[in-house]
Interface confidence: low
C-alpha cells in the first residue's frame, strides 16, 4: 500500500526534510508550500494554514520557487549600447546584452554590465578571430600576398589580385594594381593564370618603400610583420 500523503502544512518526521517545492518554516515548525515563480509569500504559513502567495508587482519578479516576503526589483533599463533580450516579467529579470558591433567587457550573472565597441583592425591587419558576445576581435597582420585596406571589425585579409601586368605591387594594406589586360584572381584552386613575374620570397626582408612610377617586377615582396598591438584602432 502506498504511504499516506501528507498535505501542507505538516510536521516532518524527525530527521527528515521537506519535499520538493516546500520549505521548513522555523516559526510554525512545519513543512509549508513555496510560492511559484512570479509570486511571493504574502502570508507565511502557520500550524493550521499554508503559505498564502501573491503575484509580484510591476517591475518586480521571482524566478525560483520561494517564500520571500517581497519580489526582487528588476534591473535598470538597458543603456544605449545594449539591447533588451529578455523583458522584465513577474518571473524573470530584465536581461541586457550588447548591441551588434559591441561585446561584453564586464558581464554579470545574466546579461552584461559593461559593453565595449569591438576592436577595428586597421589597414594592413585583418580579423584573425571574430568578436563574440563576450570577447573582442583579434587582429593579425596580413601575410605576404594578402591585404586589408579597411578599418574594420569584420574584414579578413584578402589575397592580392593576380595581374597580367602589375602597375603597382600590392602590400599589406593595398591590393595590387594591374594595368593593360584584365586581372584574374587567385581564388579558386586550379585557376589558370598567365605567366607572372617571379616573386621574391626571401624570408626576412623589410617592408618595401613606396613604389616609384617605374613598374616593379617583384610584386610579392613579403612584408615584415608588424606587431599585432599596432593592428587595431579604438583602444
Amino acid at each position: 500500500l502506498p504511504a499516506q500523503v501528507a498535505f501542507t502544512p505538516y510536521a516532518p518526521e524527525p530527521g527528515s526534510t521537506c519535499r520538493l517545492r516546500e520549505y521548513y518554516d522555523q516559526t510554525a515548525q512545519m513543512c509549508c508550500s513555496k510560492c511559484s515563480p512570479g509570486q511571493h509569500a504574502k502570508v507565511f504559513c502557520t500550524k493550521t494554514s499554508d503559505t498564502v502567495c501573491d503575484s509580484c508587482e510591476d517591475s518586480t519578479y521571482t524566478q525560483l520557487w520561494n517564500w520571500v516576503p517581497e519580489c526582487l526589483s528588476c534591473g535598470s533599463r538597458c543603456s544605449s549600447d545594449q539591447v533588451e533580450t529578455q523583458a522584465c516579467t513577474r518571473e524573470q529579470n530584465r536581461i541586457c546584452t550588447c548591441r551588434p558591433g559591441w561585446y561584453c567587457a564586464l558581464s554579470k550573472q545574466e546579461g552584461c554590465r559593461l559593453c565595449a565597441p569591438l576592436r577595428k583592425c586597421r589597414p594592413g591587419f585583418g580579423v584573425a578571430r571574430p568578436g563574440t558576445e563576450t570577447s573582442d576581435v583579434v587582429c593579425k597582420p596580413c601575410a605576404p600576398g594578402t591585404f586589408s585596406n579597411t578599418t574594420s571589425s569584420t574584414d579578413i585579409c584578402r589575397p592580392h589580385q593576380i595581374c597580367n601586368v602589375v602597375a603597382i605591387p600590392g602590400n599589406a594594406s593595398m591590393d595590387a594594381v594591374c594595368t593593360s589586360t584584365s586581372p584574374t584572381r587567385s581564388m579558386a584552386p586550379g585557376a589558370v593564370h598567365l605567366p607572372q613575374p617571379v616573386s621574391t620570397r626571401s624570408q626576412h626582408t623589410q617592408p618595401t618603400p613606396e613604389p616609384s612610377t617605374a613598374p616593379s617586377t617583384s610584386f610579392l615582396l613579403p612584408m615584415g610583420p608588424s606587431p599585432p598591438a599596432e593592428g587595431s584602432t579604438g583602444d
Epitope: 502506498p2 500523503v5 520538493l20 516546500e22
Partner: antibody, heavy 127, light 109 residues
C-alpha cells in the same frame, strides 16, 4: 500504476466524441498532470493537451487543438477529452499519458516528460 | 518549437552502434526527452532532460546535448532495440507546444 483509454471507435465527419482516461494504482492529485497525445496510422506522435490532476483544473493545449478539443478532470480517477467537428485528419490512436508534477504551488506540469502511457484507443473518422 | 529528427531510418548489426539526432528550432535548454515505441504499443520514456536515463533503461542508451542539437546513442545494439525512437521538446511555455520529432526507425540486422 496504469492508464487506460476508452471511448474510441468509428465516427462520422463533423461528429463529436468523448474519450476517457482511467487511472489506476494512483490518485489524480496535484502530483500529476494527465495529458493526451495522438498518433495517426503510420505517423509520428502529436501532443494535444494536459490538465492538472489536482483541484486547480489548470489545462493547456497545443495551439492547433484550442477550441475544438477540450480536456477535463471528470473524477478523481478519470480525465476526458471532448472532441468536436472531427475530420478524417483526426483519425488516430489517442493516448493518455502521465506527467509528474511537484508538491506545492505547481502551476504547470513542467517539464513535460510523459513517463506513463495508456495502450491507446483508436478513433476512426469516416463516412 | 520545431524538432527536426534525423535520420528517418537507420540500420545496424547486433552489437553495433546507432546515433539519432534531434535539432530544436529554439533554445530549449536541456528539456528534451527520448521515447522508444514498438508496433502496437505506446511510447516508453527512455531519457529525460537530454541525458538522464529512466529507471530500468540499460546504460547502452545515452543522450547528450550541444546547444540546440541533441543526440541519442544506442551502443551494443540488441534485437530488442528494434523500434521507432522519438525526441520530444519538454520545454513548457504558454506559447510553445510540446513537440515531438518525426521519429527514427531503428532496424537491427
Amino acid at each position: 500504476q496504469s492508464l487506460e483509454e476508452s471511448g474510441g471507435g468509428l465516427v462520422k465527419p463533423e461528429g463529436s466524441l468523448t474519450l476517457t482516461c482511467a487511472v489506476s494504482g494512483f490518485d489524480l492529485n496535484s502530483y500529476y498532470w494527465i495529458c493526451w497525445a495522438r498518433q495517426a496510422p503510420g505517423k509520428g506522435l502529436e501532443w494535444i493537451a494536459c490538465i492538472d490532476g489536482g483541484s486547480t483544473g489548470s489545462a493547456y493545449y497545443a495551439s492547433w487543438a484550442k477550441g475544438r478539443l477540450s480536456i477535463s478532470k471528470a473524477s478523481s480517477t478519470t480525465v476526458t477529452l471532448q472532441m468536436t467537428s472531427l475530420t478524417a485528419a483526426d483519425t488516430a490512436t489517442y493516448f493518455c499519458a502521465r506527467v509528474q508534477s511537484y508538491v506545492g504551488y505547481a502551476n504547470y506540469g513542467y517539464p513535460n516528460y510523459f513517463n506513463l502511457w495508456g495502450p491507446g484507443t483508436l478513433v476512426t473518422v469516416s463516412s | 518549437i520545431e524538432m527536426t529528427q534525423t535520420p528517418s531510418s537507420v540500420s545496424a548489426a547486433v552489437g553495433g552502434t546507432v546515433t539519432i539526432n534531434c535539432q530544436s528550432s529554439e533554445d530549449i535548454d536541456s528539456y528534451l526527452a527520448w521515447y522508444q515505441q514498438k508496433p502496437g504499443q505506446p511510447p516508453k520514456l527512455l531519457i529525460y532532460h537530454a541525458s538522464y536515463l529512466t529507471s530500468g533503461v540499460p546504460s547502452r542508451f545515452s543522450g547528450s546535448r550541444s546547444g540546440t542539437e541533441f543526440t541519442l546513442t544506442i551502443s551494443d545494439l540488441e534485437c530488442d532495440d528494434a523500434a521507432t525512437y522519438y525526441c520530444q521538446s519538454a520545454y513548457y511555455s504558454s506559447s510553445a507546444d510540446n513537440t515531438f520529432g518525426g521519429g527514427t526507425e531503428v532496424v537491427v540486422k
